[in-house]
């Protein structure tokens, strides 16, 4: 089929390929200190690392992209490491009428792939 | 809200920022000539270009990533240009029993954003 199995062993060495990494960030870092009340520090999982040929391909498009990048590196970029799923996070923030809780479904990455 | 409006004017100049571009590819280019029968040439729309700060942010996570990249460029990568949606493509391919048509929903990009 067009969708070969994604490669999961990193040919570049440990920690070099696309993976999830935790980044500590304060509300000040994010520019949110004026409206988010809690939590005051966030553990922001992010997708980092390289995407060598066919490593964790998101889908058929990513596989094609990887192949065409090999043929035309100046014209077609390599796939890059982006979230495949997210973990919801509840933030407490100020509103015009007081304080509110809101769930953000797209704030913290849960998994990564190469797209 | 945490999700500011995505910026759509490219500060780097025309054609430099994340956009959809059509790449012509033959079945030979893709390594599919042994099993795909038609179409024999594909118009593969791909996402190319840079993702300057907050340009076409996919979601809250991408905005955070952009901000943290500004603060810690060595630790947090910039968002990158990936498909936001896809156009289905029907391929005719050989099977053990003859010829089959199959729709691929994740082969050709239809829109792009910075994730």
């Amino acid at each position: 089929s067009a969708h070969a199995h994604p490669r999961d062993s990193c040919p570049l060495g440990p920690g070099r390929c696309c993976h999830l990494e935790t980044v500590q960030a304060t509300l000040e870092d994010l520019g949110w200190s004026d409206w988010v009340l809690s939590p005051r520090q966030l553990q922001l999982s992010m997708c980092v690392g390289e995407c060598p040929h066919l490593y964790r391909s998101a889908n058929t498009h990513a596989q094609i992209k990887a192949r065409l990048h090999g043929l035309q590196p100046d014209k077609v970029p390599a796939p890059c490491c982006v979230p495949s799923s997210y973990t919801p996070v509840v933030l407490m923030h100020r509103t015009d009428s007081g304080v509110s809780l809101q769930t953000y479904d797209d704030l913290v990455a849960r998994g990564c792939h190469c797209a | 809200s945490a999700h500011a409006h995505p910026r759509d004017s490219c500060p780097l100049g025309p054609g430099r920022c994340c956009h959809l571009e059509t790449v012509q590819a033959t079945l030979e280019d893709l390594g599919w000539s042994d099993w795909v029968l038609s179409p024999r040439q594909l118009q593969l729309s791909m996402c190319v270009g840079e993702c300057p700060h907050l340009y076409r942010s996919a979601n809250t996570h991408a905005q955070i990533k952009a901000r943290l990249h500004g603060l810690q460029p060595d630790k947090v990568p910039a968002p990158c240009c990936v498909p936001s949606s896809y156009t289905p493509v029907v391929l005719m391919h050989r099977t053990d029993s003859g010829v089959s048509l199959q729709t691929y929903d994740d082969l050709v990009a239809r829109g792009c954003h910075c994730a």
């Epitope: - | 000539s33 042994d34 038609s38």
Partner: antibody
Framework: QVQLVQSGAEVKKPGSSVKVSCKAS????????ISWVRQAPGQGLEWMGG????????NYAQKFQGRVTITADESTSTAYMELSSLRSEDTAVYYC???????????WGQGTMVTVSS | DIVMTQSPLSLPVTPGEPASISCRSS???????????LDWYLQKPGQSPQLLIY???NRASGVPDRFSGSGSGTDFTLKISRVEAEDVGVYYC?????????FGGGTKVEIK
């Protein structure tokens, strides 16, 4: 079952243009290519051009190059064929058909009669 | 452009009897993948064309098994094993190997 429904008959003056539409009813183009084929009265079939996903760039028969424009709007599942600088020889029934690349034209529109007459 | 030539021009048939239509191309339609890029279409009176056979010998969905396609390279044949009254119309071969797609001139099948 997807059907291709074309716009109605047109009568045009020589030198003018005509734009024929082809809408996928009961579904979308679904990843199929769209070809345009015409048939002059009492004559055979003649391919004009086609467009494949993502419907960005069309491919035209040399005979019609510069006179025909084929486009498709995925959001409305509608394809268009515009033919300019019409002459009497363009009087024909114009069909749209879906296919896989250039082959397997398995669903055809009902045809649109275009008459070019002064 | 690839030129497609059909014969005969007209074919009077008797219901229940077999019928055969020939199609010849000016260059080979056999691709290196082993498939012949030739389709057959039937246009019944007052109707749009309909697909019968694709890639030389593959019957399209819903097409009765009395229709079969054969041949390779430049010579192709459409056979109807037992003609029925509903099979009348004009049959076209079409090459899909390269653009522009080209059709044969058509063979008119009518009941004797």
């Amino acid at each position: 079952q997807v059907q291709l429904v074309q716009s109605g008959a047109e009568v045009k003056k020589p030198g003018s243009s005509v734009k024929v539409s082809c809408k996928a009813s009961g579904g979308t183009f679904g990843g199929y290519a769209i070809s345009w084929v015409r048939q002059a009265p009492g004559q055979g079939l003649e391919w004009m051009g086609g467009i494949i996903p993502p419907y960005a760039t069309a491919n035209y028969a040399q005979k019609f190059q510069g006179r025909v424009t084929i486009t498709a709007d995925e959001s409305t599942s509608t394809a268009y064929m515009e033919l300019s600088s019409l002459r009497s020889e363009d009087t024909a029934v114009y069909y749209c058909a879906r296919g896989v690349g250039t082959t397997h034209l398995d669903v055809w529109g009902q045809g649109t009669m275009v008459t070019v007459s002064s | 452009d690839i030129v497609m030539t059909q014969s005969p021009l007209s074919l009077p048939v008797t219901p229940g009897e077999p019928a055969s239509i020939s199609c010849r191309s000016s260059q080979s339609l056999l691709h290196s993948n082993g498939y012949n890029y030739l389709d057959w279409y039937l246009q019944k009176p007052g109707q749009s064309p309909q697909l019968l056979i694709y890639l030389g010998s593959n019957r399209a969905s819903g097409v009765p098994d009395r229709f079969s396609g054969s041949g390779s390279g430049t010579d192709f044949t459409l056979k109807i094993s037992r003609v029925e009254a509903e099979d009348v119309g004009v049959y076209y071969c079409m090459q899909a190997l390269q653009t522009p797609i080209t059709f044969g001139g058509g063979t008119k099948v009518e009941i004797k």
